[in-house]
């Protein structure tokens, strides 16, 4: 149990859990450095709770702190491609609404050929993130090498 | 206080904040890929609040989603060293039981000596979680340099 | 709604939520390879929710187990750079009070500009968190390339 | 059922140029990677050029890399491989080739191959 | 780029028996990126083997792959008459991919 009774009755989106794990669906086509996500039980072990997918980028439902992570892998890659086709970058961020675009993660590639961080930030119910793959190289999609989740941590 | 008084007469356990930090105790034996943990106060820094090691490896016993790091640090490493005796490869999974086996989390050092990540992932009662690294380069054991730790976040 | 009513009139803090995320403000002067930190929605999108600041270093204000990470970008940087310079490394430790002084995470740029990483680690009411970068590299104060941030995750 | 067809290999002199064309069907074209492989006569295979899925991400071996182009289109299910300046060395048989769903380079359907003979 | 070395050049056996066939990369493979293809003469590679162990869909079980880092290899645990072929290995963890020259199983 994890609160006392009274608080079983609540379902558990009340209690503001709000948490996503996504896997890479697809790139983007020309000129689009989007990576596309999708996320469910389907799937294997990606789901959605509380956010949705809206065009494969993730959307916010509840106003808090989230702890943002994301893993990358590229999938033709050696530490001499990486630095070759330097610089592949991957920034996450905010892309819509317009007015609150801004970038909130970025790491770039260099000689390794995966990159993962995470960090703490607010988001407002609507948000929508993106994450930006500049470069000419394409990350794997196994589901053990790229992901991109978030976790709701408090108001 | 963490929360109202009616609720802090309950253990915190039954409030499902399972959570362990371990520090690397040692490497297993030739063919045997494993690091193997260890964890509790007298150790330093390391704790299992919930989970428990089996013969050094993680038993998770509260189903949910868990937010799951790790950082391994080689010892012996320089960029060289690293590209020369390269692939090293870390890979975070579910080892028992055998039906629920899956790679939950892998990375390469490339020319790097340190890898670190994290994820969220769905785990059940007695699921067994292994690391492994494959390579010939050994694992530092510094406190602060390598650890593998998990977090209860939701059910 | 977070939790039931009851629990909707106790203040956050008292929830035991304390949580903070804080941007580069400037490096150390010789001699004193400390980072400082900033943090407030005046500075974008960081804040302070329990920990507070004392003199750009972080000061814990409620016992528990907490989640730390951190990103750092070096600014001037390339593969080469990262290489020549090498060893350029960060520390993120307790730093004060002096009698609980300890490296709690290591990490070495080598080939690379950019470390990331996070974990699990129990931090007491006074204690003051210090990030060591040492090396000649200087790290970049672009909000979403280098951050330091702490989240309560349990007593 | 997967079908790669190739298409468009035959005779050319040193320097000219020839233009590849693979017809994909009985997959999702616009969701896989894929690659050129060739073959030259009684010799090793090699791979030659790839594309992501949505032809945002391209990649060539050092050997073709300023001469050929990869490319496809979605819309009709073709893969494409324009060689110019070609060499006596770029004589083989080509092949399209899949990747695996992960993106990474190993290759679960092929084309039968077209010939590309430069002399 | 990495180098794959197969040996032997031929393997002259007879159905029934057992084939061992090995590939050795100039560096290490990684995270065992790594596969096996049957060519028969006039015809395209057939996908046999990725991930060094996993057989692709629709192998026989008596094909298996092992082996990382360095070496691998791809045994036959009893040659039935259609696995008379040319043999390929194939690393993938680092680009660009690259092939082996091959092992022709013949029968003796």
């Known amino acids: 149990q994890r609160f006392a009774q009274a608080q079983q009755q609540l379902p558990l989106e009340s209690l503001g859990w709000d948490v996503a794990e996504l896997q890479l669906n697809h790139t983007g086509p020309q000129q689009d450095p989007r990576l596309y996500w999708q996320g469910g039980p389907a799937l294997g072990r990606s789901f959605l709770h509380g956010p949705e997918l809206d065009k494969g980028q993730l959307r916010i439902h509840r106003d808090g702190i989230y702890m943002v992570h994301i893993q990358v892998t590229l999938a033709i890659c050696s530490s001499t491609t990486a630095s070759r086709h330097h610089p592949t970058t991957l920034a996450v961020g905010i892309c819509s609404p317009a007015s609150r675009s801004i970038s909130l993660l970025r790491l770039s590639f260099h000689q390794g050929c995966t990159i993962a961080s995470q960090r703490l930030t607010p988001l407002a119910r609507g948000d929508t993130l993106c994450t930006n793959l500049t470069g000419t190289l394409l990350p794997s999609r196994n589901t053990d090498e790229t992901f991109f989740g978030v976790q709701w941590v408090r108001p | 206080q963490r929360f109202a008084q009616a609720q802090q007469q309950l253990p915190l356990e039954s409030l499902g904040w399972d959570v362990a930090e371990l520090q690397l105790n040692h490497t297993g034996p030739q063919q045997d890929p494993r690091l193997y943990w260890q964890g509790g106060p007298a150790l330093g820094r390391s704790f299992l609040h919930g989970p428990e090691l089996d013969k050094g490896q993680l038993r998770i016993h509260r189903d949910g989603i868990y937010m799951v790091h790790i950082q391994v640090t080689l010892a012996i490493c320089s960029s060289t060293t690293a590209s020369r005796h390269h692939p090293t490869t870390l890979a975070v999974g579910i080892c028992s039981p055998a039906s629920r086996s899956i790679s939950l989390l892998r990375l390469s050092f490339h020319q790097g000596c340190t890898i670190a990540s994290q994820r969220l992932t769905p785990l059940a009662r007695g699921d067994t979680l292994c690391t492994n690294l494959t390579g010939t380069l050994l694992p530092s054991r510094n406190t602060d340099e390598t650890f593998f730790g998990v977090q209860w976040v939701r059910p | 709604q977070r939790f039931a009513q009851a629990q909707q009139q106790l203040p956050l803090e008292s929830l035991g939520w304390d949580v903070a995320e804080l941007q580069l403000n400037h490096t150390g002067p010789q001699q004193d390879p400390r980072l400082y930190w900033q943090g407030g929605p005046a500075l974008g999108r960081s804040f302070l929710h329990g920990p507070e600041l004392d003199k750009g270093q972080l000061r814990i204000h409620r016992d528990g187990i907490y989640m730390v990470h951190i990103q750092v970008t070096l600014a001037i940087c390339s593969s080469t750079t990262a290489s020549r310079h090498h060893p350029t490394t960060l520390a993120v430790g307790i730093c004060s009070p002096a009698s609980r002084s300890i490296s709690l995470l290591r990490l070495s740029f080598h080939q690379g500009c950019t470390i990331a990483s996070q974990r699990l680690t129990p931090l007491a009411r006074g204690d003051t968190l210090c990030t060591n970068l040492t090396g000649t590299l200087l790290p970049s104060r672009n909000t979403d390339e280098t951050f330091f941030g702490v989240q309560w995750v349990r007593p | 059922e997967v079908q790669l067809l190739e298409s468009g290999g035959g005779l050319v002199q040193p320097g000219g140029s020839l233009r590849l064309s693979c017809a994909a069907s009985?997959?999702?074209?616009?969701?896989?990677?894929m690659s050129w492989v060739r073959q030259a006569p009684g010799k090793c295979l090699e791979w030659v050029s790839a594309i992501g899925e949505g032809g945002g991400y391209t990649y060539y071996a050092e050997s073709v890399k300023g001469r050929f182009t990869i490319s496809r289109d979605n819309s009709k299910n073709t893969l494409s491989l324009l060689m110019n300046s070609l060499r006596a060395e770029d004589t083989a048989v080509y092949y399209c080739?899949?990747?695996?769903?992960?993106?990474?380079?190993?290759?679960?359907?092929w084309g039968q191959g077209t010939l590309v003979t430069v002399s | 780029e990495i180098v794959l070395t197969q040996s032997p050049g031929t393997l002259s056996l007879s159905p029934g028996e057992r084939a061992t066939l090995s590939c050795r990369a100039s560096q290490g493979v990684r995270s065992s990126y790594f596969a096996w293809y049957q060519q028969k003469p006039g015809q395209a590679p057939r996908l046999l083997i990725y991930?060094?162990?996993t057989r692709a869909t629709g192998i026989p079980a008596r094909f298996s792959g092992s082996g990382s880092g360095t070496d691998f290899t791809l045994t036959i645990s009893r040659l039935e008459p259609e696995d008379f072929a040319v043999y390929y290995c194939?690393?993938?963890?680092?680009?660009?991919?690259?092939f082996g020259c091959g092992t022709k199983v013949e029968i003796k």
């Open positions: 080739a899949r990747h695996d769903y992960s993106n990474y380079p190993y290759f679960d359907y």
């Open positions: 194939q690393q993938y963890g680092s680009s660009p991919p690259t």
């Open positions: 009985g997959f999702t074209f616009s969701s896989y990677a």
């Open positions: 991930g060094a162990s």
